[in-house]
């Protein structure tokens, strides 16, 4: 038989970036992997020139994964670097609760990664704690805004916060810098993903920065500490917005009210819409100074009319086991206005 070989030789002019060698120093990192790969594009019939990432200028492939513990030298052989993106995963875990308690870690994209000429898509931190021993608190460098339909984020990046427990479908939400959320406390394992949306992220990278600390265990799924600004309305919504707060889950908002201000708390629906299969869904609004509280049955009562709070207060929402299709989703806002008369 005759052996026929059909092959194609592709000669392409390297871009400026292809002539450079980029150093990615992950030698001081632990439990981290960085993958550079093609962005998804639907199959095209058109011939597309090659796009490769090269390690040490020798081994070239369309996908490359770098792991922590080493210093890597990479270069690119690609006609259009926008065809690539990178995704990074890093795990921060605590196995010994006595050692970890109060320990803090900075969640920041290393500068070597920021300097690569490829779009950073996601940088995910998996934060793991010993079950029922410790919880986590996230403190942003800049206060965060929760992405809502009424007030969407319009920054070049956001933090997506979700449970990292496989059996638990809990998405806390998307948060971007420039809001009123001072900290987020979560009960157990979570993933925090910094997702970028535009090239301007390179310039705005200084606005990123979260600190995670291991704190004593608490029972609520999440606690949001909110310090509203006088200038704008703060929109807040329950986790798992479209799918509904998971069964028997409890979340709280600790809302600060400055001495010279009054906070107006407004709910955006007349009724919660939840129908309980078992248990009760309720909401507690508690004044922090006097401990006076109002309790609302979310599966029966109408939601409260706009209420005015002269002191810091708590909003706690606890879910029942809802009937499928009748989930608990609540959106509310807090607006500060100057006090006209001292009512203390």
């Amino acid at each position: 038989g005759i052996l026929r070989l059909q092959f194609q030789v592709l000669v392409q002019h390297p871009q400026n970036e292809s002539n450079k060698i980029y150093v990615v120093d992950l030698s001081n990192e632990r439990a981290m992997s960085l993958t550079i790969e093609p962005r998804p594009v639907k199959q095209s019939r058109k011939f597309v020139p090659g796009c490769f990432v090269c390690l040490e200028s020798r081994t070239c492939s369309s996908n490359l994964t770098l792991t922590s513990g080493s210093k890597h030298k990479i270069s690119f052989l690609c006609d259009d670097l926008t065809r690539l993106w990178m995704n990074v995963e890093k795990t921060i875990s605590c196995t010994d609760h006595r050692y970890c308690q109060r320990k803090s870690y900075s969640l920041q994209v290393p500068s070597d990664i920021l300097h690569l000429p490829v779009e950073l898509h996601d940088f995910s931190w998996k934060l793991l704690v010993p079950k029922d021993r410790l919880s986590l608190v996230l403190v942003p460098a800049q206060k965060l805004q929760q992405h809502t339909h009424e007030k969407p984020c319009n920054t070049s990046f956001s933090y997506l916060v979700a449970s990292a427990i496989p059996s638990q479908d809990l998405y806390f939400g998307s948060f971007c810098p420039g809001g009123s959320i001072k900290q987020i406390q979560v009960k157990q394992n979570i993933s925090v993903t910094l997702r970028t949306f535009a090239p301007s992220f390179q310039q705005e990278a200084s606005r990123q920065g979260l600190t995670v600390s291991f704190i004593p265990y608490f029972k609520e799924e999440g606690v949001f500490t909110v310090t509203p600004d006088t200038k704008s309305k703060v929109y807040l919504r329950t986790p798992n917005w479209d799918r509904g707060l998971p069964s028997l889950t409890s979340v709280s908002w600790n809302i600060s009210v400055p001495r010279d201000q009054v906070a107006c708390l407004t709910f955006f629906k007349e009724r919660s819409g939840v129908v309980c299969q078992t248990g009760r869904a309720f909401m507690i609004i508690q004044e922090q100074r006097t401990r006076a509280e109002e309790i609302f049955s979310l599966d029966e009562d109408v939601l409260p009319k706009p209420s005015f709070h002269h002191h810091s207060f708590w909003v706690n929402i606890s879910n029942c086991s809802p009937t499928s299709g009748k989930q608990l989703d609540l959106l509310f806002s807090v607006t500060l206005t100057p006090r006209t008369v001292d009512l203390t």
């Epitope: 962005r39 998804p40 594009v41 639907k42 199959q43 926008t82 993106w85 779009e119 898509h121 992405h147 339909h149 969407p152 319009n154 956001s158 997506l160 998405y171 998307s174 997702r195 970028t196 949306f197 535009a198 090239p199 479209d242």
Partner: antibody, heavy 122, light 107 residues
Framework: QVQLVESGGGVVQPGRSLRLSCAAS????????MHWVRQAPGKGLEWVAV????????YYADSVKGRFTISRDNPKNTLYLQMNSLRAEDTAVYYC???????????????WGQGTMVTVSS | DIQMTQSPSTLSASVGDRVTITCRAS??????LAWYQQKPGKAPKFLIY???SLESGVPSRFSGSGSGTEFTLTISSLQPDDFATYYC?????????FGGGTKVEIK
Amino acid sequence: QVQLVESGGGVVQPGRSLRLSCAASGFTFSSYGMHWVRQAPGKGLEWVAVVWYDGTIKYYADSVKGRFTISRDNPKNTLYLQMNSLRAEDTAVYYCASQYSSGWHTDFFDVWGQGTMVTVSS
Amino acid sequence: DIQMTQSPSTLSASVGDRVTITCRASQSISTWLAWYQQKPGKAPKFLIYKASSLESGVPSRFSGSGSGTEFTLTISSLQPDDFATYYCQQYSGYSLTFGGGTKVEIK
């Protein structure tokens, strides 16, 4: 081949609700942002909403904010648009469209469905 | 929101003509602009992205140019199949907007 098929349109009274579906095939649905775009009779195209490929982030046009909800079910390769408190001005052909890629500045549409007509009238 | 203004709204031309459609943005959108063609009763068809990159399978008589706020779609030699309505779309921000459309009709 790559295909999007909308369903769920019809005639509905003002103030009522309707849910549109869009079934995707021929591509990895879970890798792409999905959008709804509408076109009123004899008028131009109007973008309605987007949902990120993994369902985490959504944006809406001001004209539908608070009334419409976009969602997706990746295992079922299906996109949805829940339309509440419908108004006469929501009357249009609703197209679902898949964005070109994912990531920075790729929200233009290389695949469109055939459209489904929604008429809001008393 | 960024407004997109297309001109002219209607254009009469003959087969073989060179046709130019203009799209203006109310603020700079760099080159984040796409063009579509739509025929009556049909879904739009994607032609051009990033102001000037031609989609695979689109005839080379179509070309796009421009950056910032001013963009053009040019059909170098109009064919019978090209009589349709053309729309520009910006994707610079989170809220996407289309131009009002330009109908290319037979003179």
